[in-house]
């Protein structure tokens, strides 16, 4: 019963985590304009992995996609790749884990096969979570580096009384969503791996059976039988990440007479 609960909970936690990773990947608020110097700006900038947006105080929001591959920073491409790999692995993991669930009966599938599949999905969830955490962390590191670089050159072109203030960017809501989602996927994966151990059939010790033949006595004692999972069933992966969540900024809708890409 505890095994089924652990497996079910692992599946649900991973499902939430992967949904979060997908949400974070699609979100536009990976980096948001730092409002420290101008808290009442009439123009608010924010950027995602796929497009950058500008929200005016008038309520009008304009988003522009990054219509180039080669012109984008290598780090951004790496983050995109990590997030996509995380989503793909997580999706495959979810698919495998559905069939591995103890509460679902598919034909005459043996417990050993279910244990195999549970472990496979668990490992996939762990890798998926790590990919998401890595992707978000790489982006966060990129932001921190750029933030301090732009702080160093905060005002460029101080010709007379004319100032050009550089826009600085800070952590957006998507980073926190990504960290939490990656952590949940990782936890779900660990739970699946733990559940796998309970699913694997225990070592069965059969009592010795004596066969009496005429003339001489032969005792037949079969050795202990152990189900092979195809993986090391004693795998213990207890790497757990716990992130903090922050809600996304409210975006006003605006009746637009134009249609922007």
């Amino acid at each position: 019963m505890a095994v089924t609960a652990c497996q079910g909970l692992g599946f649900v936690v991973s499902l939430i985590g992967i949904a979060g990773i997908i949400a974070a990947t699609c979100m536009d608020q990976w980096s948001t304009q730092d409002l420290y110097n101008n808290p009442v700006t009439a123009v608010f900038n924010y950027q995602g992995l796929w497009r950058s947006c500008v929200r005016e105080s008038s309520g009008f929001t304009e988003c522009r996609g990054y219509f180039t591959l080669l012109g984008l920073p290598a780090m951004l491409q790496a983050v995109r790749a990590l997030m996509i790999v995380g989503i793909v692995l997580g999706a495959i993991g979810l698919l495998v884990s559905i069939f591995a669930l103890k509460c679902i009966r598919i034909g005459s599938m043996e417990d050993s096969a279910k244990a195999n599949m549970t472990l496979t999905s668990g490992i996939m969830f762990i890798v998926s979570g790590l990919c998401a955490i890595a992707g978000v962390s790489v982006f966060a590191n990129m932001l921190v580096t750029n933030f301090w670089m732009s702080t160093a050159n905060m005002y460029t072109g101080m010709g007379g009384m004319v100032q050009t203030v550089q826009t600085r960017y800070t952590f957006g809501a998507a980073l926190f969503v990504g960290w939490v989602a990656g952590g949940l996927t990782l936890i779900g994966g660990v739970m699946m791996c733990i559940a796998c151990r309970g699913l694997a059939p225990e070592e069965t010790n059969y009592k010795a059976v004596s066969y009496h033949a005429s003339g001489h006595s032969v005792a037949y004692k079969p050795g202990g039988f152990k189900a092979s999972t195809g993986f090391g069933s004693n795998t213990k992966n207890k790497k757990i990440y716990d992130g903090g969540a922050r809600t996304e900024d409210e975006v006003q809708s605006y009746p637009s007479k134009h249609d922007y890409v």
Epitope: V43, N45, S57, S58, T164
Partner: antibody, heavy 118, light 113 residues
Framework: DVQLVESGGGLVQPGGSRKLSCAAS????????LHWIRQTPEKGLEWVAY????????YYADTVKGRFTISRDNPKNTLFLQMTSLRSEDTAMYFC???????????WGQGTLVTVST | DIVMTQSPSFLTVTAGEKVTMSCRSS????????????LTWYQQKPGQPPKLLIY???TRESGVPDRFTGSGSGTDFTLTINSVQAEDLALYYC?????????FGAGTKLELK
């Protein structure tokens, strides 16, 4: 057709109060941010206050902060400006205006004159 | 606060000629996020409220004649009226639309020679 009509102006004693109204019609009132802008021959156009479509955020010019309060009643399609502790320098023609693309004001009312004098 | 400086204060013109007026801001109005300049131009005739002419420094509002052209970037902006008509005689204001408080220039008055 978009229409903004201000009312509530008049002669007020220094230190007194006044509430201006702006009745809107011809557009989805609750979908737009709105402003109060005033004009004097000496100072020209001066932005006073802004209220977003959802009533938050609200911004004020430093010259009126703490004395003026902007508010809106979306069901009634009305914008308000409550003015207190009025000074002679608050004497102006007060316009309400609709916020538009590029943070511009695309529609203005005809204005209401507020005179602060003894 | 961003200070808007308009020049000249007065402009005397004859019908049909090309007119150029300037607006300078104390801080750049160019937003890096969308590469748009947050500067607006208005026209005000006596006894009337201001009328929106141009936003985003160069985007003409619908219904505005194409003889009105806005240009410039960063801190220096220009409003050009090609072939001035009698109905164009008015006060022209530029406005900072980049950050609060939203500030206006003192205006350029277009007068007939």
């Amino acid at each position: 057709d978009v229409q903004l009509v201000e009312s509530g102006g008049g002669l007020v004693q220094p230190g007194g109060s006044r509430k201006l109204s702006c009745a809107a019609s011809g557009f989805s009132f609750s979908g737009f941010g709105l402003h109060w802008i005033r004009q004097t021959p000496e100072k020209g156009l001066e932005w006073v206050a802004y209220i977003s479509s959802g009533s938050r955020p609200i911004y004020y010019a430093d010259t009126v902060k703490g004395r003026f309060t902007i508010s809106r009643d979306n069901p009634k399609n009305t914008l308000f400006l409550q003015m207190t502790s009025l000074r002679s320098e608050d004497t102006a023609m007060y316009f309400c205006a609709r916020f538009y693309f590029g943070n511009s004001f695309d529609h203005w009312g005809q204005g209401t004159l507020v005179t602060v004098s003894t | 606060d961003i200070v808007m400086t308009q020049s000249p204060s007065f402009l005397t013109v004859t019908a049909g000629e090309k007119v150029t007026m300037s607006c300078r801001s104390s801080q750049s109005l160019l937003n890096s996020g969308n590469q748009r300049n947050y500067l607006t131009w208005y026209q005000q005739k006596p006894g009337q409220p201001p009328k929106l002419l141009i936003y985003w420094a160069s985007t003409r509002e619908s219904g505005v004649p194409d003889r009105f052209t806005g240009s410039g970037s960063g801190t220096d902006f220009t409003l050009t009226i090609n072939s001035v008509q009698a109905e164009d005689l008015a006060l022209y204001y530029c406005q900072n639309a980049y950050s609060f408080p939203l500030t206006f220039g003192a205006g350029t008055k277009l007068e007939l020679k």
